[in-house]
């Protein structure tokens, strides 16, 4: 996704994005909370595709690993947290049933706040 | 994705998530920046699946439409901004070529900062 820094902006939380193949992902959690195996190849009409996923997570090496950037620290505690979304993937469940299921993948790094008590 | 409010937390930016069908989406932008038509149905081994996408964007009705929550306003201007990610979808390009392409979809609402000048 577009880089805020190019517009002279900073993100409240630093993130890293990468392309991940099913060969590296291996397993995932589906919408019902079950662990499924992510298949390497997707049969398409006239061939096979590698399953790829575009994943974004909080940067563990970033400035914001100790808390979010730009927060009013007098009133708030903050934390950068990886959030997930759902994408459809060809998977196999624990009963060896192959099918298209929505799995959770990391898609963003957002800032969450808790109010400071007892100031 | 998990709701921070359940843990007594607030998001710096308010977001809304929804399931969107290809019938509603109609078109999208692919990785090369071209506009493609998103096909309603995907042929699978035993029939057809409706193409669905899980999309998250900034809540236009939310508290944070004027700026991000919890920001140190003495030093920063802030804005909640919808970010995008890539998912694979069955699409048709302008030359009527049908194929699996990575398209951009809304996946998050994050806060971006610009430093306040001339205080």
């Amino acid at each position: 996704h577009s880089d805020p820094a190019r517009r002279g902006e900073l993100s409240v939380c630093d993130s890293i994005s990468e392309w991940v193949t099913a060969a590296d992902k291996k397993t995932a959690v589906d919408m019902s909370g079950g662990t499924v195996t992510v298949l390497e190849k997707v049969p398409v009409s006239k061939g096979q595709l590698k399953q790829y996923f575009y994943e974004t997570k909080c940067n563990p090496m970033g400035y914001t690993k100790e808390g979010c950037r730009g927060i009013d620290k007098r009133h708030w505690n903050s934390q950068c947290r990886t959030t997930q979304s759902y994408v459809r993937a060809l998977t196999m469940d624990s009963k060896k049933r192959i099918g298209w299921r929505f799995i959770r993948i990391d898609t963003s790094c957002v800032c969450t706040l808790t109010i400071k008590r007892g100031r | 994705h998990s709701d921070p409010a359940r843990r007594g937390e607030l998001s710096v930016c308010d977001s809304i998530s929804e399931w969107v069908t290809a019938a509603d989406k109609k078109t999208a932008v692919d990785m090369s920046g071209g506009t493609v038509t998103v096909l309603e149905k995907v042929p699978v081994s035993k029939g057809q699946l409706k193409q669905y996408f899980y999309e998250t964007k900034c809540n236009p009705m939310g508290y944070t439409k004027e700026g991000c929550r919890g920001i140190d306003k003495r030093h920063w201007n802030s804005q909640c901004r919808t970010t995008q990610s890539y998912v694979r979808a069955l699409t048709m390009d302008s030359k009527k070529r049908i194929g699996w392409r990575f398209i951009r979809i809304d996946t998050s609402c994050v806060c971006t900062l610009t430093i306040k000048r001339g205080r």
Epitope: T21, V44, K46, G47 | M31
Partner: antibody, heavy 119, light 108 residues
């Protein structure tokens, strides 16, 4: 600019071993599956081996299975090919090639390193 | 394993003319075909992917098309730098990824 630089080639006797390296720069190395393709003198191109971005998946041509081992060190942005039990028919220029995310074709190639197997 | 057969083995053309190169697959591969150019002493360079999509920076005189299992690379108005060997590659069924034997385009 994307750059792939192979090294480690040389003249060896049948039955001996060699380790080829490919130093990558100018792109996010772990985002891409990588491959080795070889070309015997005056001949066409032959795909040899491939590896997924994080190394979880490895793939080999039948002609090299059991003798060749592909690996990568993402911290060093380097791809490797360990070649054992060399045969005369392994004599070739070995190219390191970056796989596109859009499909299993090669969008960038190194200049190659020559392996000569001769008694 | 999918076999790709390229023809002709050598194509002799005058600069400015059109060159038509053929690649036939032994079975259906959809549009999962790429074309590469290789000059003597150099690495191959990607020209076309998905049978008809031009790679970044490739001049529009290069075009690809498909008809069933027959694929064509057309070079309109051959420039001096276009004289080289051209290879097709399938990525429909893998592994293995397979290449055609190549077509050499030489100056008439």
């Amino acid at each position: 600019d994307v750059q792939l630089v192979e090294s480690g080639g040389g003249v060896v006797r049948p039955g001996e071993s060699l380790r080829l390296s490919c130093a990558a720069s100018g792109f996010t190395f772990n985002n891409h599956d990588m491959n080795w393709v070889r070309q015997a003198p005056g001949e066409g191109l032959e795909w040899v081996s491939g590896i997924s971005g994080r190394g979880g998946g490895t793939y080999y041509a039948d002609s090299v299975k059991g003798r060749f081992t592909i690996s990568r060190d993402n911290s060093k942005n380097t791809l490797y090919l360990q070649i054992n039990s060399l045969r005369a028919e392994d004599t070739a220029i070995y190219y390191c090639a970056r796989e596109s995310i859009w499909g299993i074709f090669f969008d960038y190639w190194g200049l190659g390193t020559l392996v000569t197997v001769s008694s | 394993e999918i076999v790709l057969t390229q023809s002709p083995g050598t194509l002799t053309v005058s600069p400015g003319d059109r060159a038509t190169l053929s690649c036939r697959a032994s079975q259906t591969i959809g549009s999962y075909l790429a074309w590469y150019q290789q000059k003597p002493g150099q690495a191959p360079r990607l020209l076309i992917y998905d049978a008809s999509s031009r790679a970044t920076g490739i001049p529009d005189r290069f075009s690809g098309s498909e008809s069933g299992t027959d694929f064509t690379l057309t070079i309109n108005g051959l420039a001096p730098e276009d004289f080289a060997v051209y290879y097709c590659q399938q990525y429909s069924n893998w592994p293995p990824l397979t290449f055609g034997g190549g077509t050499k385009v030489e100056i008439k």
